[in-house]
Amino acid sequence: SSSPRSGALLRGCPTHCHCEPDGRMLLRVDCSDLGLSELPSNLSVFTSYLDLSMNNISQLLPNPLPSLRFLEELRLAGNALTYIPKGAFTGLYSLKVLMLQNNQLRQVPTEALQNLRSLQSLRLDANHISYVPPSCFSGLHSLRHLWLDDNALTEIPVQAFRSLSALQAMTLALNKIHHIPDYAFGNLSSLVVLHLHNNRIHSLGKKCFDGLHSLETLDLNYNNLDEFPTAIRTLSNLKELGFHSNNIRSIPEKAFVGNPSLITIHFYDNPIQFVGRSAFQHLPELRTLTLNGASQITEFPDLTGTANLESLTLTGAQISSLPQTVCNQLPNLQVLDLSYNLLEDLPSFSVCQKLQKIDLRHNEIYEIKVDTFQQLLSLRSLNLAWNKIAIIHPNAFSTLPSLIKLDLSSNLLSSFPVTGLHGLTHLKLTGNHALQSLISSENFPELKIIEMPYAYQCCAFGVCENAYKISNQWNKGDNSSMDDLHKKDAGMFQVQDERDLEDFLLDFEEDLKALHSVQCSPSPGPFKPCEHLLDGWLIR
């Protein structure tokens, strides 16, 4: 039931529009998407919100909304406005939000915006604005948010921005801006968010961001930058930086030394070849660092002071060694991907107590020592494929209670230690041509997927009769419970040529019943029969 006052309010609702009280004895009026070609005439003086978006309004007359002194939000988006005359918003003393996006404005309506002293949010995006007059925002002392994205700007309207000292967020994205001059935002000391993505920016003045002392988010993605934006060095409060999808070839030494608050840096899709060794130092808030294909990196980066890194990906470089103290710098590391490098020797990772995933495939590693992966209690996945590993210490994996995925394919193994691997669900040994011994399934009670060098080795896993097609399931089934991994026993693979064939086949029959769910490849078949097992045993 509505009060007499709200009933009176609703009687001032224009035809076809939807109206409701706003809880303060003022009226919210929704006239959107009604095909209107002009503003409704009988608006209540008590209107606080007026939505005229998605109509066919092509012009506003001077003073079209007389006496709406309580109006706080006016939406005119999605119309056909090409020009807004002086006086269009006269008398709107309370106006805080003005939405003019998705129209056909060719310049900022300077005169119409004069004296909107309460305006806090102005949307001018998705128009055809190519010109921003120098004084167009001069009366907007309260403006906090400004959208100028998706227009036709070719340069930063530096003069117009001088009066916006209260501005907190601005987007100039999706324009045709090609250069940012020095002090372009010199008076915007309250600005927290600045979006400049999807422009044509190819050069930055070396002091172009000076004055932006509150800036926390800077988006330079999808531009034409061919040099690292060193101008960011004055942004001491910067938390999020994006410059992905540019043409930057190198990141200099101490690149982010002026930005100690950085949490996120997005710089993928750049042809980065070189990164200064000190580039990522002293970033205590940084959690993720990803660098793929920087082929001129020969040394592991010095990450002093970047101790909270949780994920480090540095692939396709030419790193040949890791410092022995790598984990002292990175005690919180959970994911380490150093694949496609030239690593030969590995340090002990045991100080990296939080490591869950290590990817070292496609390196030059030849040996896994006893201390390399000791006591990594959280390690779930270890990829050592495509190396030159010939030797693995018998206890190299003995203290990895959470390990469920191990990839040692395409190495030079002739034997394989199983101590500590009883929790594995995924094991890859394919491509180790010298590894010809049979493997006992008893060591792997949790195993779901195994890939062996030879088909006959799959017979121990009950795959003789029905060839199992292994789809790419290596990365699936990562959620199994770790609760009882500590209860399982570990042992070494048994070399089967020490046993009578009959004994083996009896054992195998038992295994077959227990391991019907294991997927093993290459599957035995007509051209890779289990009978291959007999080859070396018929002659005694």
Epitope: N237, V257, G258
Partner: antibody, heavy 118, light 111 residues
Framework: EVQLVQSGAEVKKPGESLRISCKGS????????IEWVRQAPGKGLEWIGE????????NYNEKFKGHVTISADKSISTAYLQWSSLKASDTAVYYC???????????WGQGTLVTVSS | DIVLTQSPASLAVSPGQRATITCRAS??????????MHWYQQKPGQPPKLLIY???NLESGVPDRFSGSGSGTDFTLTINPVEANDAATYYC?????????FGGGTKLEIK
């Protein structure tokens, strides 16, 4: 309140080395450029160079490049101007200043008088 | 380097009168809509004090008797009305390009 406090007056002989300091307080020291400006006795102002303490980025007036070095220690919010070999012509009052809006020199230290005489 | 020439080198003005100081640059100090000219006041035995930045913007705390104008190569500092404690040397400075340069100074005396 922003303050720049400079070290005291120095009297040196030609060929000697010297380092003078400028300690900033009341603002984020690493986020603003510190400039060095000199004023020879009875003369006008001359810009020597600047440093951004947060990044150790420096810009020098070519006239002074190689003769002076500008540095900073952000841990103690202090900028330095140093000479490895002073000349009599280095006699002047040296000011440090903190950058302001649009590269103006908004705050100034009290100045350090350096006298170089044999 | 951009050379800044101030004139006059000195002037004497009575309190309540207008003082006008000009600064001419050897090349334009305009860049992308901004004119990078600043004005400073220096009293004997004191460091300079910023009065006006970017040609015409009054620094906080500076009385509005001080004003600046100009663009390109020609700039003016005006003090109106002059007061007794305005006696000082006034310098213009450009930072459109490095090295930053100062004018030679204009000494204002109060009659």
């Amino acid at each position: 309140e922003v303050q720049l406090v400079q070290s005291g007056a120095e009297v040196k002989k030609p060929g000697e080395s010297l380092r003078i300091s400028c300690k900033g307080s009341g603002y984020s020291f690493t986020a603003y450029w510190i400039e060095w400006v000199r004023q020879a006795p009875g003369k006008g102002l001359e810009w020597i160079g600047e440093i951004l303490p947060g990044s150790d980025s420096t810009n020098y007036n070519e006239k002074f490049k190689g003769h002076v070095t500008i540095s900073a220690d952000k841990s103690i919010s202090t900028a330095y101007l140093q000479w490895s070999s002073l000349k009599a012509s280095d006699t002047a009052v040296y000011y440090c200043a903190r950058s302001g809006l649009y590269g103006s020199s908004q705050y100034w230290g009290q100045g350090t008088l350096v006298t170089v005489s044999s | 380097d951009i050379v800044l020439t101030q004139s006059p080198a000195s002037l004497a003005v009575s309190p309540g009168q207008r003082a006008t100081i000009t600064c001419r640059a050897s090349e334009s100090v305009d860049s992308y809509g901004n004119s990078f000219m600043h004005w400073y006041q220096q009293k004997p035995g004191q460091p300079p004090k910023l009065l006006i930045y970017l040609t015409s913007n009054l620094e906080s705390g500076v009385p509005d008797r001080f004003s600046g104008s100009g663009s390109g190569t020609d700039f003016t500092l005006t003090i109106n009305p002059v007061e007794a404690n305005d006696a000082a040397t006034y310098y213009c400075q450009q930072n459109a390009e490095d090295p930053r340069t100062f004018g030679g100074g204009t000494k204002l005396e109060i009659k």
